[in-house]
Interface confidence: low
């Protein structure tokens, strides 16, 4: 018996061939011997089966001795043994129809679980192998689960159902809803304007939800909400903003926040959360702000940084075009009795300068100038 696998919703063509290459009488029946379709001369006739409105054949092939049964919009319950009667012979074809669906929605938040469920006819024992967009394979039975979805899991999942050494392939498009970056860090000199950007890693027709930025300043004992906002059809509107600092927010995507001035009391880390309409859970992006200040007080030149710096970052004070006078893995460095000239304070990581602040030291009778 020939086995043919079909996909729910698709069209399948079951073949039946006579030895005579001409149009002769044929009938297709199901396992209950109920007639599905056949011919009467050059006319197609249909029987009383449940497939009535979805069954068809190709009259153009009859003259070649081919009498296919075409079933449109396949359903799981169409799985059956179909019998073609032609020339006093019976050809049996077993049709097995499978369906593969994603749990509830194909748009899932980063960190959520994806469950793929296989619908299969009774008595079948298929195995399923799915390949994710990043090329990883999952194998399983009637359900396949992937926990902790990551950004790289966005895209087309290709799933192969194997039954009786035959295969049928499903493609499911999964969109992982996430920010492009899980975390970002901004380095600024004191007084500079700070731009925070939160680009999304997906595009959808309509995007509605609400968000909030919580900020934990390094100097503060607790975190506080800096801004709350609404998102309606990709338009951003601010609901509430603190007076200090007074953040400004862009009206369009990507989400964009401006802090008028980088000050030591603002240095720290924030967590922007975005709750999307009709989704459980939230999107998160961490943002960090490091602020640098260089000052000269009497005979002491000091450079300080505030905010979440890694222990391997180096803070240096050097006179322009000279070797560093002081260089430490600390958050403050200083030079006593600095000689006159343009001094540079550098925050660097493995030789790469992340932040630089210049301060001009004048001869001792003058006051310092910050360019």
């Amino acid at each position: 018996k020939k086995v043919v696998l079909g996909k729910k919703g698709d069209t399948v063509e079951l073949t039946c061939t006579a030895s005579q290459k001409k149009s002769i009488q044929f009938h297709w029946k199901n396992s209950n011997q109920i007639k599905i379709l056949g011919n009467q001369g050059s006319f197609l006739t249909k029987g009383p089966s449940k497939l009535n409105d979805r069954a068809d054949s190709r009259r153009s092939l009859w003259d070649q001795g081919n009498f296919p049964l075409i079933i449109k919009n396949l359903k799981i319950e169409d799985s059956d043994t179909y019998i073609c009667e032609v020339e006093d012979q019976k050809e049996e074809v077993q049709l097995l129809v499978f369906g593969l669906t994603a749990n509830s929605d194909t748009h899932l938040l980063q960190g959520q679980s994806l469950t793929l469920t296989l619908e299969s006819p009774p008595g079948s024992s298929p195995s399923v192998q799915c390949r994710s967009p990043r090329g990883k394979n999952i194998q399983g039975g009637k359900t396949l689960s992937v926990s902790q979805l990551e950004l790289q899991d966005s895209g087309t999942w290709t799933c192969t159902v194997l039954q009786n050494q035959k295969k049928v392939e499903f493609k499911i498009d999964i969109v992982v809803l996430a920010f492009q970056k899980a975390s970002s860090i901004v380095y600024k000199k004191e007084g500079e304007q700070v731009e925070f950007s939160f680009p999304l890693a997906f595009t959808v027709e309509k995007l509605t939800g609400s968000g909030e930025l919580w900020w934990q300043a390094e100097r503060a004992s607790s975190s506080k909400s800096w801004i709350t906002f609404d998102l309606k059809n990709k338009e951003v509107s601010v609901k509430r903003v603190t007076q200090d600092p007074k953040l400004q927010m862009g009206k369009k995507l990507p989400l964009h926040l401006t802090l008028p001035q980088a000050l030591p009391q603002y240095a720290g880390s924030g967590n922007l959360t975005l709750a999307l309409e009709a989704k459980t859970g939230k999107l998160h992006q961490e943002v960090n702000l490091v602020v640098m200040r260089a000052t000269q007080l009497q005979k002491n030149l000091t450079c300080e940084v505030w905010g979440p710096t890694s222990p391997k970052l180096m803070l240096s004070l050097k006179l322009e075009n000279k070797e560093a006078k002081v260089s430490k893995r600390e958050k403050a460095v200083w030079v006593l009795n600095p000689e006159a000239g343009m001094w540079q304070c550098l925050l660097s990581d493995s030789g790469q300068v992340l932040l630089e602040s210049n301060i001009k030291v004048l001869p001792t009778w003058s006051t310092p100038v910050q360019p």
């Epitope: 024992s125 195995s127 394979n137 039975g141 396949l144 689960s145 194997l162």
Partner: antibody
Framework: QVQLQESDPGLVKPSETLSLTCTVS????????WSWIRQPAGKGLEWIGR???????NYNPSLKSRVTMSVDTSKNQFSLKLSSVTAADTAVYYC??????????????WGQGTTVTVSS | DIQMTQSPSSLSASVGDRVTITCQAS??????LNWYQQKPGKAPNLLIY???NLETGVPSRFSGSGSGTDFTFTISSLQPEDIAAYYC?????????FGQGTRLEIK
């Protein structure tokens, strides 16, 4: 609570075929892969292969030529046959359930193991 | 086949100590690594799946980390009942392979 129990083959003579059966109780054999793993005394774990409820198999290439696995869903059992055994096949043989899904993957239920000695 | 190299092969530590075992894969296996505990005369027991996820019912003193080729298994405060052999296992590709194991004993 799913439990696995390996059969006891006792002593097997060199060049003969080792046959083991694992009985699954407290749950269905369907919708999972089922693995065989062995461990020579004082040594590490070696994966022999696995079988799915539908009968599809994956074998370790190092043993493929000698291994046959089968499944009997009506009895909730799966079996291992290892042909042309030598003293090097002496080990504790375990059956285990492979939890599906690649993030969730893990051999999360194991039999208690059965000692197989190959000796004339 | 992907080779898994565990180190050390054996170690001795005192109750309350922090114990670390490493596992190195011969090629990139992303996060597709599990850790098992095997007590003498018993079958292995799954502790950590997908490099860092604690299996249900496993004490929180056990943890795992790593990605790519280098992985670490840690017991934050060694208890007498932790005396066992520990194995890493990759499932990035077939055949599934295990590390050679680390035997842990109490000083």
């Amino acid at each position: 609570q799913v439990q696995l129990q390996e059969s006891d083959p006792g002593l097997v003579k060199p060049s003969e075929t080792l046959s083991l059966t694992c009985t699954v109780s407290g749950g269905s054999i369907s919708s999972y892969y089922w693995s065989w793993i062995r461990q020579p005394a004082g040594k590490g774990l070696e994966w022999i292969g696995r079988i799915y409820a539908s009968g599809s198999t994956n074998y370790n290439p190092s043993l493929k030529s000698r291994v046959t696995m089968s499944v009997d869903t009506s009895k909730n059992q799966f079996s291992l046959k290892l042909s042309s055994v030598t003293a090097a096949d002496t080990a504790v043989y375990y059956c285990a359930r492979d939890r599906e899904g690649y993030y969730y993957y893990g051999m999360d239920v194991w039999g208690q193991g059965t000692t197989v000695t190959v000796s004339s | 086949d992907i080779q898994m190299t565990q180190s050390p092969s054996s170690l001795s530590a005192s109750v309350g100590d922090r114990v670390t075992i490493t596992c190195q894969a011969s090629q990139d296996i992303s996060k597709y690594l599990n850790w098992y505990q095997q007590k003498p005369g018993k079958a292995p027991n799954l502790l950590i799946y997908a490099a860092s996820n604690l299996e249900t019912g496993v004490p929180s003193r056990f943890s795992g980390s790593g990605s790519g080729t280098d992985f670490t298994f840690t017991i934050s405060s060694l208890q007498p009942e932790d005396i066992a052999a520990y194995y890493c296992q990759q499932y990035d590709s077939l055949p599934i392979t295990f590390g050679q194991g680390t035997r842990l004993e109490i000083k």
